[in-house]
């Protein structure tokens, strides 16, 4: 059982544990999300992502979650259960990112560019909100991310 993001294989990640961690904080996160009209991981970001694109896209999205979302939210929360859940998610995201090695070959430029444009849509939506709201919304949308990642899961 592993993820196949195009040519990038990821082993040792148990999706069950990601869901368990997310569900432990979902109600809290989504209750704090007051901007229900906006979505960060909108349709255009995740729909019809080719296998080749998927490695680049998941790499950039998870890196963003690690460097911007978890890191900043960690400094703002004190609840032990919440911290534990985010640690589980972050550790697994690190494990995924560490195994992703998207090709930097020139012939992959258009695919890399397409994935980057998708990521920019997400980042733009994130930056349009104030920091607190953006972090809360990004965390509340981890389920959207996990659901999309299932498309690349192999039994």
């Amino acid at each position: 059982q592993e993820f196949h993001f195009g040519p990038c294989q990821v082993k040792g990640v148990v999706p069950q544990k990601l869901w368990e961690a997310f569900w432990a904080v979902k109600d809290t996160m989504q209750a704090q999300d007051n901007i229900t009209s906006a979505r960060l991981l909108q349709q255009e970001v995740l729909q019809n992502v080719s296998d080749a694109e998927s490695c680049y896209l998941v790499h950039t999205l998870l890196e963003f979650y690690l460097k911007t979302v978890f890191k900043n939210y960690h400094n703002r929360t004190v609840e032990v259960r919440t911290l534990k859940s985010f640690s589980t998610l972050a550790n697994n995201f690190v494990l995924i990112v560490s195994q992703l090695q998207p090709s930097q070959e020139n012939e992959m430029f258009s695919i890399r560019d397409s994935a980057h444009r998708r990521f920019l849509l997400f980042r733009r939506a994130f930056k349009q909100l104030d920091v607190e709201a953006a972090l809360t919304k990004a965390l509340g949308e981890v389920d959207i991310l996990l659901t999309w990642m299932q498309k690349f899961y192999k039994l």
Epitope: Q16, W19, D143, K151
Partner: antibody, heavy 119, light 108 residues
């Protein structure tokens, strides 16, 4: 080899209660979420309930909330469904299913147990 | 709540191609599964994650998912493929699995 064996199905009167069990083997039970899915006579599949591997998260179909309770005993590798205030429309074959992703990827199913609610 | 729509029945001539569709709002953003069920038997997973085949499932079964429609394709349908087929997704906003109403495939 993954095996799921349901039991506890019976004929019960409206308003009555029943507890279904699903004995699991062939995999590390507490690593996997599990679900109950039912099928009324001549009808399609209907999701009933979900429980995470650690048992901390439980979800139910709207029409079953408050009447049904899903639980698991990881030491016994067994999944349960406690059904109260049963109605005639709960008559169905009840299947337990192993969730291989944690959010509705049912790669393995039991053979089902028949629940009949009738006076 | 999220709904999936399947046509009740589809017929196909032996060894021809059958297509069974499953409609749902923006289903392309979700991961779609397909299950085969024969009379008196438990469902069997034939396609998961839109287009992946579990081991033991014949190559004639394939799937796709885009926009508002997921499709199960059986290329060169065999008599043993006659069964009910159900699509299914996870609705993360409701924390619930959702099944389509099912399609009965008849192989002529």
């Amino acid at each position: 080899e993954v095996q799921l064996v349901e039991s506890g199905g019976a004929l019960v009167q409206p308003g009555g209660s029943l507890r279904l069990s699903c004995a699991a083997s062939g995999f590390t039970f507490d690593d996997y979420a599990m679900s109950w899915v039912r099928q009324a006579p001549g009808k399609g599949l209907e999701w009933v309930s979900h429980i995470s591997g650690n048992g901390h998260s439980t979800f139910y179909a709207e029409s079953m909330k408050g009447r049904f309770t899903i639980s698991r005993d990881n030491a016994k590798n067994t999944l349960y469904l406690q059904m109260n205030s049963l109605k005639s429309e709960d008559t169905a074959v009840y299947y337990c299913a192993k969730d291989d992703y944690g959010s509705g990827l049912y790669a393995y199913w039991g053979q089902g147990t028949q629940v009949t609610v009738s006076s | 709540s999220y709904e999936l729509t399947q046509s009740p029945s589809v017929s196909v001539a032996l060894r021809q191609t059958a297509k069974i569709t499953c409609g749902g709002d923006n289903i392309g953003s979700k991961s779609a599964q397909w299950y085969q069920q024969k009379p008196g038997q438990a469902p069997v997973l034939v396609i998961y994650a839109d287009s992946r085949r579990p081991s033991g499932i014949p190559e004639r079964f394939s799937g796709s998912n885009s926009g508002n429609t997921a499709t199960l394709t059986i290329s060169g349908a065999q008599a043993e493929d006659e069964a009910d087929y159900y699509c299914q997704v996870w609705d993360s906003s409701a924390n619930a699995a959702v099944f389509g109403g099912g399609t009965h495939l008849t192989v002529l």
